[in-house]
């Protein structure tokens, strides 16, 4: 056959669906690779063809659209499973072509099994709720397009294994789950199961997401430098190792980039000639506030190094702060044996 623009295997779109549930999968060509949509392509006389390669096989084969009850069907640029089976797992290809044009892309589809508590190998989206922030909602995700607006589905919400009912601060409201006041105890996996009828059959859509309760913007502050501070002086003799920790607390801020860096005499360590190393460690609180520690280390400090200015800087979306470390050269201790002996008139 003639040349075809092959976009390869789009592993960015690792699609995971539950066994025995409907799945609607849009051809990624129109979403990520081509500058026109399906309607335009169809009007221009292009045909969308689907085929697949089973798991652990190399052979591309056409998709069987003549299964009982139309279990697999195509509608415009969507491939439908009503429902999926475990052995539908494989790489699926959609190809758009006519006599003069051809473009195709493949993507992996994994049909996964869940246990009785909705645990599975499915990668879960994370939804962050602000702690004690007032009413916040999560919405049952990725259920659009499965049934018409005239169909009224039933939605059951679970936290872990248990139906959400009589919870103090969590209320199911159809497709939404409302948190009246989010607390750390609300951390966990939440599952909505949408049940709807279609052509005399009942279908279920299971969607699980992880809720993480994080620090509220109401409580957010600019970065706080705990160290260096005015109470600690780094006194060293030449030849000793100089270690100065810069420890900074960052309030949780959605999509904020937290930065910590040192300057030595106003320059970044990379821009000066002395042999300095920086080691960073990061820890998080239960509400995802962040503590970053950067330890500045000079293995064998010189008297010149001890005269330099060492400043720790920190920046977040809330602001920028800086703090200088107090560094000085240790005054040599008196050599007591000699001096005291002289004092007593020893010859």
């Amino acid at each position: 056959s003639e040349r075809c623009d092959d976009w390869g295997l789009d592993t960015m779109r690792q699609i995971q669906v539950f066994e025995d549930e409907p799945a609607r999968i849009k051809c990624p060509l129109f979403e990520h690779f081509l500058k026109f949509n399906y309607s335009t392509a169809h009007s221009a006389g292009l045909t969308l063809i689907w085929y697949w390669t089973r798991q652990d096989r190399d052979l591309e084969e056409p998709i069987n659209f003549r299964l009982p009850e139309n279990r697999i069907s195509k509608e415009k640029d969507v491939l439908w499973f009503r429902p999926t089976l475990l052995n539908d797992t494989g790489n699926y290809t959609c190809m758009l072509r006519n006599t003069t044009y051809c473009s195709k892309v493949a993507f992996p589809l994994e049909v996964v099994q869940k246990d009785s508590c909705f645990n599975s190998p499915m990668k879960l989206p994370v939804h962050k709720l602000y702690i004690e922030y007032g009413i916040q909602r999560i919405t049952c995700p990725n259920v659009d397009g499965y049934f018409p607006s005239s169909v009224k589905p039933t939605i059951t919400w679970y936290m872990g294994c248990y139906k959400i009912q009589n919870f103090n601060n969590v209320i199911p409201e159809g497709m939404n789950l409302s948190f009246l006041i989010a607390l750390i105890s609300n951390n966990g996996n939440y599952t909505c199961v949408v049940t709807y009828p279609e052509n005399g059959r009942t279908f279920h859509l299971t969607r699980t997401l992880t809720v993480k309760v994080v620090g509220s913007p109401k409580n957010a502050v600019p970065p706080v430098i705990h160290s260096p501070n005015d109470h600690v002086v780094y006194e060293k003799e030449p030849g000793e190792e100089l270690l100065i920790p810069c420890t900074v607390y960052f309030s949780f801020l959605m999509d904020s980039r937290n930065e910590v860096w040192w300057t030595i005499d106003g320059k970044k360590p990379d821009d000066i000639t002395i042999d300095v190393t920086i080691n960073e460690s990061i820890s998080h609180s239960r509400t995802e506030d962040e503590t970053r520690t950067q330890i500045l280390s000079i293995k064998k400090v010189t008297s010149e190094d001890l005269k330099r200015s060492y400043v720790c800087h920190a920046r977040s979306a809330k602001g920028e702060v800086a703090k200088a470390a107090k560094v000085k050269q240790k005054v040599p201790a008196p050599r007591y044996t000699v001096e005291l002996a002289c004092g007593f008139g020893a010859t």
């Epitope: 539950f18 025995d20 429902p83 099994q113 039933t154 009589n166």
Partner: antibody
């Protein structure tokens, strides 16, 4: 379409055990709950317990705890209900009922178990 | 265990009549209520789940409503094929429990 086919009628002596099977087809056996419900002659429905064949998780009604055992064979898509220490009041029709969640969407045809000396 | 009380235990109505069956729970069940239909000598069939969700293939003359502890099954226009016993069942808290049943007959 979903089908649950149960084993045939049984006549048992008091003190013995009975094992009723329920063969499932037309859906993913490991992804739904299999419930067991009984109905004594002329009486209402009584839930006994359920099993999730995917991971073997079971829940039993307190009344039957220790006397009923629910199992599932994934290779044959068959669920089993074994009731031991039978007495005359266990005479009933025993149903299996499949539910993706908690409602029992589809039921087997029922198995009559008669306990008589 | 949650007790489910159905009323009436039996009723007789004419074809085309509106029929109402009620079910009362011994505590709130948060709409986690199903209705089943059982015809003589047959297995039960799910009619309605989660108080008001019509199961696939069930005629629209069947409807459910209620909240808290009190729930209702309504047949808007009784048909000869609706002769059966109807059971409510809670699935709020294990063990699942059924009402005693309501036998519906044609006058």
């Amino acid at each position: 379409q979903v089908q649950l086919v149960q084993s045939g009628a049984e006549v048992k002596k008091p003190g013995s055990s009975v094992k009723v099977s329920c063969k499932a087809s037309g859906y993913a056996f490991t992804s739904s709950w299999m419930n067991w419900v009984r109905q004594a002659p002329g009486q209402g429905l009584e839930w006994m317990g359920r099993i999730y064949p995917g991971d073997g998780n079971t829940h039993y009604a307190q009344k039957f705890q220790g006397r009923v055992t629910l199992t599932a064979d994934k290779s044959t898509s068959t669920a089993y209900m074994e009731l031991s220490s039978l007495r005359s009041e266990d005479t009933a029709v025993y149903y299996c009922g499949e539910g993706y969640l908690d409602p029992m969407d589809y039921w087997g045809q029922g198995t009559l178990v008669t306990v008589s000396s | 265990d949650i007790q489910m009380t159905q009323s009436p235990s039996s009723l007789s109505a004419s074809v085309g009549d509106r029929v109402t069956i009620t079910c009362s729970a011994s505590q709130g069940i948060n709409n986690y209520l199903n209705w089943y239909q059982q015809k003589p000598g047959k297995a039960p069939k799910l009619l309605i789940h989660y108080t008001s969700g019509l199961h696939a293939g069930v005629p629209s003359r069947f409807s459910g409503s209620g909240s808290g502890t009190d729930y209702t099954l309504t047949i808007s226009s009784l048909q000869p094929e609706d002769v059966a016993t109807y059971y409510c069942q809670q699935y709020s808290i294990l063990p699942w429990t059924f009402g005693g049943g309501t036998k519906v007959e044609i006058k």
